[in-house]
């Protein structure tokens, strides 16, 4: 369960793949599309608001009766729109929604290092946001592979400015 309904903290960042391609968002026909692309040198990177939430592991999962605390994030590139997992289509989509956000908008944060992260679906453990054919997709990961696959790793570059009002 997510502890509280408000995030413990927020940060504004640009998101890129492990291979330094940018994650960009474009409004097309009244809906947003997500692209993975090489950015022209002078083009500004798109910003994403990451909201961090605390969540308790059910004690049965921790195996010894002790709850573990994990971080979950929601990702919002523009006001009122959030990245969501579509588990049926194995896709990652941008949807306009009101709070409280649906479970599909929450991702368990895994840090490889501080700025290198992966996002695991809250609704489908073992399934991560990844890169497939220059798009974001949901990718099933075998835990024995140590979550090391580069296609599920993303780099976060924090942007320091007042980040509570983003457009």
């Amino acid at each position: 369960s997510i502890t509280g309904i408000s995030p413990i903290t927020e940060s504004l960042a640009s998101l890129s793949t492990y291979n330094d391609q940018s994650i960009t968002f474009a409004l097309e026909d009244e809906s947003y599309e997500i692209y993975v692309e090489d950015l022209k040198k002078d083009k500004k990177k798109d910003k994403v608001l990451l909201s961090y939430y605390e969540s308790q592991h059910p004690s049965s999962e921790s195996g010894d009766g002790v709850d573990g605390k994990m971080l979950m994030v929601t990702l919002s590139p523009t006001k009122d729109f959030w990245l969501q997992a579509n588990n049926k289509e194995h896709s990652v989509e941008l949807h306009k929604c009101e709070k409280p956000l649906p479970d599909q908008a929450f991702f368990v944060l895994h840090n490889r290092s501080f700025n290198c992260v992966s996002f695991e679906c809250k609704t489908d453990p073992g399934v991560f946001i990844g890169v497939k054919d220059n798009h974001l997709a949901l990718i099933k990961v075998d835990y024995s592979e140590n979550l090391g696959s580069e296609n599920i790793l993303f780099k976060l570059s924090e942007i320091l400015e007042h980040h509570h009002h983003h457009h």
Partner: antibody
Framework: EVQLVESGGGLVQPGGSLRLSCSAS????????MNWVRQAPGKGLEWVTA????????YYADSVKGRFTISRDNSKNSLFLQLNSLRAEDTAVYYC???????????????WGQGTMVTVSS | DIQMTQSPSSVSASVGDRVTITCRAS??????LAWYQQIPGKAPKLLIY???RLQSGVPSRFRGSGSGTDFTLTISSLQPEDFATYYC?????????FGGGTKVEIK
């Protein structure tokens, strides 16, 4: 009860080696990144090194890089620190400390051991 | 590397006083900052994480705030057990770094 217990400290000559251990209990050890932090007598806290839950990622302070090695044995709920080429300035209490969150470096160190003293002197 | 500078290095106060400790980072980050309390001869204890989140079991007289480069720990009404040394620590990038500490002493 969530607990960390360090051992292996002692008196060692400059250039010598030592292996510190930290035994964990009361939590799912493999889910958490772990750290070693030291404190020289009368001084402040200094982060030394960290290791991811799986053991696949390790990070070191410049002051110990190439001399100290962090490792873990998740099957035995144990964390280790191998100290080589020890110097007088490595004299300190060494604490092991657990990260707040599973799978994440963010947060802070929510559980600390009682510390083990390492004295480097001839 | 992010350097953390704490001030003051020591402060003399009485029971019931309001005490404010500041921590300044050499470069800005959002809010992954922690505060610890250390009593002589004991291990440090986590008080605050994510700049303002109170660790479970810590009294509400401890309050953390700030983001960017400036962070603050406030003890609203000092209690006898609060006389200790306090450290800030950035948890934003490796190497992890601590402030130099602030010793809160009895006036």
């Amino acid at each position: 009860e969530v607990q960390l217990v360090e051992s292996g400290g002692g008196l060692v000559q400059p250039g010598g080696s030592l292996r510190l251990s930290c035994s964990a209990s009361g939590f799912t050890f493999s889910s958490y990144a772990m750290n070693w932090v030291r404190q020289a007598p009368g001084k402040g806290l200094e982060w030394v090194t960290a290791i991811s839950g799986s053991g696949g990622g390790t990070y070191y302070a410049d002051s110990v890089k190439g001399r100290f090695t962090i490792s873990r044995d998740n099957s035995k709920n144990s964390l280790f620190l191998q100290l080589n080429s020890l110097r007088a300035e490595d004299t300190a209490v060494y604490y092991c400390a657990k990260q707040t969150y599973t799978s994440s470096w963010y947060g802070g160190f929510d559980i600390w051991g009682q510390g083990t003293m390492v004295t480097v002197s001839s | 590397d992010i350097q953390m500078t704490q001030s003051p290095s020591s402060v003399s106060a009485s029971v019931g006083d309001r005490v404010t400790i500041t921590c300044r980072a050499s470069q800005g980050f959002s809010s992954w900052l922690a505060w610890y309390q250390q009593i002589p001869g004991k291990a440090p204890k986590l008080l605050i994480y994510a700049a303002s989140r109170l660790q479970s079991g810590v009294p509400s007289r401890f309050r953390g705030s700030g983001s960017g480069t400036d962070f603050t720990l406030t003890i609203s009404s000092l209690q006898p057990e609060d006389f200790a040394t306090y450290y800030c620590q950035q948890a934003n990038s490796f190497p992890l770094t601590f402030g130099g500490g602030t010793k809160v002493e009895i006036k």
